[in-house]
């Protein structure tokens, strides 16, 4: 009779993470008699996964009934594969001996490659805020995927971006990768409403990419424009001095009015008026009695913008002329007032 | 980490000059502080030294005290100190390159005013 | 000028129990408050910021709330361990400030 051989057809199997791998095996005779054991991996460090014999394998379960006589189907199901799973699986006849069985054939090993989804793409931004016309750096990372072949690409506002550099790690062989990817972007003072995307595209995700997202709103710092005016007012001895903060982003800003070096007031701004761009404007007025000043007033707005050091704009008060409007021609946006009276 | 060194007994009127030094933290794209605490006070902020180098400090501060820094080393200047000036001077990072929170502090030097 | 007023000044609570601190600003400054824990001899230590996120490694029995210009921080299960100073500080603004923590809360755990 023809020596028993042990055949496993499939050379290699793929399957994704999270479905049952089937690895064949038959034998070509009952003879001799024992049991079929499976490893991954050959040589001394190789990995049992089912023996037919004893033990218990919760993930494995048989194709065919093993306890009936003449059955020569040793084919065993893997449930819920995952990436560490990946490896050649020898389905190996032993003899039976005493007092231990005598390894007899092994079959030519299937390698088993499993499909791995990355991971959502997590986009980060610098940790601090950047001005417009700076170049600031982004993140991408998606991790555990499998195969190695990925593609990344960097979006603003929808716009493709090229400055970027991408690695996916190990090099060399790994049951799953990882990529990582930074982009460099150039802020532009309209970029509060701006997204940066990044999108992954794997086979694992049949053509449907994931995509990590950040708003550069967490990044930007739109710095103010300042603007100082003087307003006629009925009152002869009133003088309404206005500091209008224009454009600015984020919100945090603090107002400090100073009457010839020597602080006023301060405030924070609260009733903002938001522009089409995402930036805010807002005002603040100071009602100066000119009768409780004898010299010329020096008055000075200055604002502090999100924790960045303070800048701010002065308005010299001419108390000896009649009060009449001066300063800037220019016509008001449409901003909020925080109107507090100064006498 | 921080560390604050020159802490010692100086009497009154004599300039000192306290160093933050830092080790394995870039400071140059930090803002950083510096904070002090009389014996069984509270905490009590000095100034700020933002990451451009501008520098802000309490209104009680002007004058009497001066910051600067390089890349890895922070300094608080005391013009001339008084003996309400002892106290535990601790260095501190910011969480970014403005004003807001102090993320990373020094374990402190004590620093002593007396005749 | 922003000034941070905090209450009270001592609190002593059993073990299990619940310590509640107050932060008042005198204007707003929407979430920009800070609380640190300081225990005695040794540098001080951020526990929250933003008014509400717990800072990397602190225990999730502490918490804060509040915006604007009232900020509360609470120990929920108050343990031995948590007995220190706790300080409010702004993160806001700092142009002509005197201080911007609070005076302080000493937590006393019997």
């Known amino acids: 009779e023809e020596e028993l051989q042990v055949i496993q057809p499939d050379k290699s199997v793929l399957v994704a993470a999270g479905e049952t791998a089937t690895l064949r095996c038959t034998a070509t005779s009952l003879i001799p008699v024992g049991p079929i054991q499976w490893f991954r991996g050959a040589g001394p460090g190789r990995e049992l996964i089912y023996n037919q014999k004893e033990g218990h394998f919760p993930r494995v379960t048989t194709v065919s009934d093993l306890t009936k006589r003449n059955n020569m189907d040793f084919s065993i199901r893997i449930g819920n594969i995952t990436p560490a799973d990946a490896g050649t699986y020898y389905c190996v006849k032993f003899r039976k001996g005493s007092p231990d069985d005598v390894e007899f054939k092994s079959g030519a090993g299937t390698e088993l490659s499993v499909r791995a989804k990355p991971s959502a793409p997590v986009v980060s931004g610098p940790a601090a805020r950047a001005t417009p016309q700076h170049t600031v750096s982004f993140t991408c990372e998606s991790h555990g995927f499998s195969p190695r072949d990925i593609t990344l690409k960097w979006f603003k506002n929808g716009n493709e971006l090229s400055d970027f550099q991408t690695n996916v790690d190990p090099v060399g062989e790994s049951v799953s990768y990882s990529i990582h990817s930074t982009a460099k972007v150039v802020l532009t003072r309209e970029d509060v409403h701006s997204q940066v995307i990044c999108e992954v595209a794997h086979v694992t995700l049949q053509g449907d990419p994931l995509r990590g997202t950040a708003n550069l709103s967490e990044t930007i710092r739109v710095p103010p424009t300042l603007e100082v005016t003087q307003q006629p007012v009925r009152a002869e001895n009133q003088v309404n001095v206005t500091c209008q903060v224009r454009k600015f982003y984020p919100q945090r800003l603090q107002l400090t009015w100073l009457e010839n070096g020597n602080v006023s007031r301060t405030e924070t701004a609260s009733t903002v008026t938001e522009n089409k761009d995402g930036t805010y404007n807002w005002m603040s007025w100071l009602l100066v009695n000119v009768s409780a000043h004898r010299d010329d007033v020096k008055l000075t707005c200055q604002v502090e913008h999100d924790g960045q050091p303070a800048v701010s704009k002065s308005h010299d008060l001419k108390v000896s002329a009649h009060p009449k409007e001066q300063g800037s021609n220019t016509a008001a946006e449409n901003t909020g007032s925080n109107e507090r009276n100064i006498y | 980490s921080l560390e604050e060194s020159g802490g010692r007994l100086v009497t009154p009127g004599t300039p000192l000059t306290l160093t933050c030094t830092a080790s394995?933290?870039?400071?140059?794209?930090?803002?950083m502080g510096w904070v002090r605490q009389a014996p069984g006070k509270g905490l009590e902020w000095i100034g700020i030294?933002?990451?451009?180098?501008s520098t802000s400090y309490a209104t009680w501060a002007k004058g009497r005290f001066t910051i600067s820094k390089t890349s890895t080393t922070m300094d608080l200047k005391m013009t001339s100190p008084t003996t309400e000036d002892t106290a535990t001077y601790f260095c501190?990072?910011?969480?970014?390159?403005?004003?807001?929170?102090?993320?990373?502090w020094g374990p402190g030097t004590l620093v002593t005013v007396s005749l | 000028a922003i000034d941070m007023t905090q209450t009270p000044a001592s609190v002593s609570e059993p073990v299990g129990g619940t310590v509640t601190i107050k932060c008042q600003a005198s204007?707003?400054?929407?979430?920009?408050l800070a609380w640190y824990q300081q225990k005695p001899g040794q540098r001080p230590k951020l526990l929250i910021y933003d008014a509400s996120k717990l800072a990397s490694g602190v225990p999730s029995r502490f918490s804060g709330s509040g915006s604007g210009t009232e900020f509360t921080l609470t120990i929920s299960g108050v343990q031995s361990d948590d007995a220190a100073a706790y300080y409010c500080?702004?993160?806001?603004?700092?142009?002509?400030?005197?201080?911007?923590f609070g005076g302080g809360t000493e937590v006393v755990v019997k």
């Open positions: 394995g933290v870039d400071l140059s794209n930090y803002a």
């Open positions: 501190a990072r910011h969480r970014s390159d403005g004003y807001d929170y102090f993320h990373l």
């Open positions: 204007q707003s400054i929407s979430s920009w």
């Open positions: 030294i933002y990451a451009g180098g």
């Open positions: 500080q702004q993160g806001y603004a700092v142009s002509y400030v005197e201080n911007i």
